[in-house]
């Protein structure tokens, strides 16, 4: 069966200067290729983390991905600012020249609140 | 207090149409996701579909894809069902169900309109 | 689909007994499940979310439990009221959106 990306969150709301979870788990590793995360959608879409060696500031990995059974890929955003809001997406990739997308998660709306 | 009131309800024929109405005060209805769930006679709880609050998201349940279009009109405040190509199966007290607004459960539902489909 | 199965389908039991009521998620549904309370010609009432987070205005004798597959309802003590049927659902998948078959809490 295809895999899916679930995020169970519709929206999470959460003030400036603190931390953030947004959950996002996947039903099978397979097809192998990276897990992604993306604030909007279409072009304009801005990748948030990528569950590689590359060093994100402020977005950290939850739980260990590189573990061989793990399908938990949510992130961690820290210290939040009002430029954080917005919809942010979970998307699976099968590995390629380049990699192509084949599933997204349902999106995960954050709200940033006034301390 | 968080209001919703079903209607449109009735006996009608196989393969007829019926539209069901859903009006909501207390919240702000546009800021919600709203659902209609039913329940046939002696059965359980049965999820048909979804609308988000700006009415962009849609999902239904495979039974009715096909034959049922959720709708909502945000300046009236009221959720519609329009079920065409009814059968018998279709036979249940259909309820309007408001989302939380972080999960997917129901946290407020109607009392819920009888359809009835029957030669 | 997530398919959800209770048990037992009935409970028959007499107030001020204690009931519990079994939810059986045929994947991980980690903590997102709901439980409702339904009575006849009334409409579904939420009681649980989260697993085990009450709702607003319930009662403390109703507490919910599980993660996971494998999810609990349970009432310390019956009152008159609590006979009625219960289901659980699951918001973890999103759409379909899933509820067990129900469980009928009965006068012994």
């Known amino acids: 069966t295809e895999v899916k990306v679930i995020q169970p969150e519709k929206s999470v709301s959460v003030a400036a200067g603190d931390s953030t979870v947004l959950n996002c788990t996947l039903t099978s590793l397979l097809p192998v290729g990276p897990i992604r995360w993306y604030r909007g959608v279409g072009q304009s879409r801005q990748l948030i983390y990528s569950f590689t060696t590359e060093h994100f500031p402020r977005v950290t990995n939850v739980s260990d991905a590189t573990k061989r059974s793990n399908l938990d890929f949510s992130i961690r955003i820290s210290n939040v600012t009002p430029e954080d809001a917005g919809t942010y997406y979970c998307v699976k990739f099968q590995r390629g020249s380049p990699d192509t997308e084949i599933q997204s998660g349902g999106g995960t709306e954050v709200y940033v609140l006034a301390k | 207090e968080v209001q919703l009131v079903e209607s449109g309800g009735g006996v009608v024929q196989p393969g007829r149409s019926l539209r069901l109405s859903c009006a909501a005060s207390?919240?702000?209805?546009?800021?919600?996701?709203v659902n209609w769930v039913r329940q046939a006679p002696g059965k359980g709880l049965e999820w048909v579909s979804l609308?988000?609050?700006?009415?962009?998201?849609?999902y239904y349940a495979d039974s009715v894809k096909g034959r049922f279009t959720i709708s909502r009109d945000n300046s009236k405040n009221t959720l519609y069902l329009q079920m065409n190509s009814l059968r018998a199966e279709d036979t249940a007290v259909y309820y309007c169900a408001k989302e939380n607004n972080r999960y997917r459960f129901f946290d407020d539902w109607g009392q819920g309109t009888l359809v009835t489909v029957s030669s | 689909e997530i398919v959800l199965t209770q048990s037992p389908g009935t409970l028959s039991l007499s107030p001020g007994e204690r009931a519990t009521l079994s939810c059986r998620a045929s994947q991980s549904v980690y903590t997102y499940l709901a439980w409702y309370q339904e009575k006849p010609g009334q409409a579904p009432r939420l009681l649980i979310y989260g697993a085990s987070s009450r709702a607003t205005g319930i009662p403390d004798r109703f507490s919910g439990s599980g993660s996971g597959t494998e999810f609990t309802l349970t009432i310390s003590s019956l009152q008159s009221e609590d006979f009625a049927v219960y289901y659980c659902?699951?918001?973890?998948?999103?759409?379909?959106?899933?509820f067990g078959g129900g469980t009928k809490v009965e006068i012994k």
């Open positions: 207390g919240f702000t209805f546009s800021s919600y996701d």
């Open positions: 659902q699951q918001y973890y998948d999103r759409p379909p959106l899933t």
């Open positions: 609308i988000s609050g700006s009415g962009e998201i849609i």
